[in-house]
Interface confidence: low
């Protein structure tokens, strides 16, 4: 799916109001262990592509994220603010139903959600610098900040 035509401001608002809190709730109770940030994104559509991938594509050691509250809200937000998104997700939904539901939050899942938080923050931080203009191409302008 091409996220270029999404309403980024509406997605930002949804993230701040609900999704962010659910991500933090998922991470709560974890020890202060650093997870290496291996996933990054350079602009808003790219961030949403990476967010979608990490949220909805099961991985061998973390197959259950798609059923979490933050994932359901992410899906609803993308369906609401990205034209045609829901139509592309029929196959993905079928795959999700087959995904194993783990009762235990594995460290791998925590790592994945930690990555997701970083991607969402990056999405937020690229948003306002780029309002009313095309995505920055100059590396010096592609700061993670800001921002709001």
């Amino acid at each position: 799916y091409d996220f270029t035509n999404c309403d980024f401001q509406k997605i930002e608002a949804d993230y701040l109001r609900t999704i962010s809190k659910d991500l933090i709730t998922y991470m709560s109770g974890t020890k202060s262990t650093d997870f290496n940030n291996t996933v990054s994104c350079s602009n808003r559509p790219h961030c949403l592509t990476e967010i979608q991938s990490l949220t909805f594509n099961p991985t061998p050691r973390c197959a259950s994220l798609a059923k979490e509250m933050f994932a359901r809200k992410t899906k609803a937000t993308l369906a609401l603010w990205c034209p045609g998104y829901s139509e592309t997700q029929i196959n993905a939904t079928q795959a999700m139903k087959k995904a194993r539901k783990s009762k235990v939050t594995t460290n791998k899942c925590l790592e994945q959600v930690s990555q997701l938080l970083g991607l969402w923050r990056r999405f937020i931080r690229t948003l306002l610098k780029q309002q009313g203009s095309s995505d920055y191409k100059d590396d010096d302008d592609k700061h993670h900040h800001h921002h709001h």
Partner: antibody
Framework: EAQLVQSGAEVKKPGSSVKVSCKAS????????MHWVRQAPGQGLEWIGA????????SYNQKFKDRATLTVDKSTRTAYMELSSLRSEDTAVYYC?????????????WGQGTTVTVSS | DIVLTQSPATLSLSPGERATLSCRAS??????????MHWYQQKPGQPPRLLLY???NLGSGIPARFSGSGSGTDFTLTISSLEPEDFAVYYC?????????FGQGTKLEIK
């Protein structure tokens, strides 16, 4: 409990550089923006810049872009702020601060501050 | 840069009184219907302490006597009934547009 502990006070000569450290504990260092703010004696707060430890990306207040350098060492969970070409007006308390968890841009944890005095 | 102007510069009140502090931005700090204005309290020799985020949300551990309102360019911090520990300097901060900026502060002193 999330905590930021900064290095001790520094006295520097004009034209020299200073490097202030900020050691984090009690939270996942690599997923929070770390900011630097300074406060001259009897004055208000002034933002210097921010760094995202996860990938080292930085953002600077243009006023400090040529003189301030923000870095992190993830292995020691420490953020650094180096300010070069010091002048007397750089005399201030320098704070590191953690940005909130939600991307809303407020500072919920602050270091205790490091006093930097620039004097000949 | 967005300039934040706080008023009054100094406010002299007695414990038990109501305090109203103002912060005016040179341009809107709103985005997506949210106001990215935050308030801090600072006491001598201490770092600032978050009071309110996004104009009206209480920071962790902040007493309910503190409240905030406003949107766009005009924001208000209200302390309903002053306690002795409330006398300090208060700063507003915006993060809607680079660079992040603070107001010059309002000093709340005992009358």
């Amino acid at each position: 409990e999330a905590q930021l502990v900064q290095s001790g006070a520094e006295v520097k000569k004009p034209g020299s550089s200073v490097k202030v450290s900020c050691k984090a504990s009690g939270f996942t260092f690599s997923t929070y923006n770390m900011h630097w703010v300074r406060q001259a004696p009897g004055q208000g707060l002034e933002w210097i810049g921010a760094i995202y430890p996860g990938n080292g990306e930085t953002s600077y207040n243009q006023k400090f872009k040529d003189r301030a350098t923000l870095t992190v060492d993830k292995s020691t969970r420490t953020a650094y702020m180096e300010l070069s070409s010091l002048r007397s007006e750089d005399t201030a308390v320098y704070y590191c601060a953690r940005e909130d968890d939600y991307g809303e841009g407020y500072f919920d944890v602050w270091g205790q501050g490091t006093t930097v005095t620039v004097s000949s | 840069d967005i300039v934040l102007t706080q008023s009054p510069a100094t406010l002299s009140l007695s414990p038990g009184e109501r305090a109203t502090l103002s912060c005016r931005a040179s341009e809107s700090v709103d985005s997506s219907g949210l106001s990215f204005m935050h308030w801090y309290q600072q006491k001598p020799g201490q770092p600032p302490r978050l009071l309110l985020y996004r104009a009206s949300n209480l920071g962790s551990g902040i007493p309910a006597r503190f409240s905030g309102s406003g949107s766009g360019t005009d924001f208000t911090l209200t302390i309903s009934s002053l306690e002795p520990e409330d006398f300090a300097v208060y700063y507003c901060q915006q993060i809607n547009t680079d660079p992040l900026t603070f107001g010059q502060g309002t000093k709340l002193e005992i009358k």
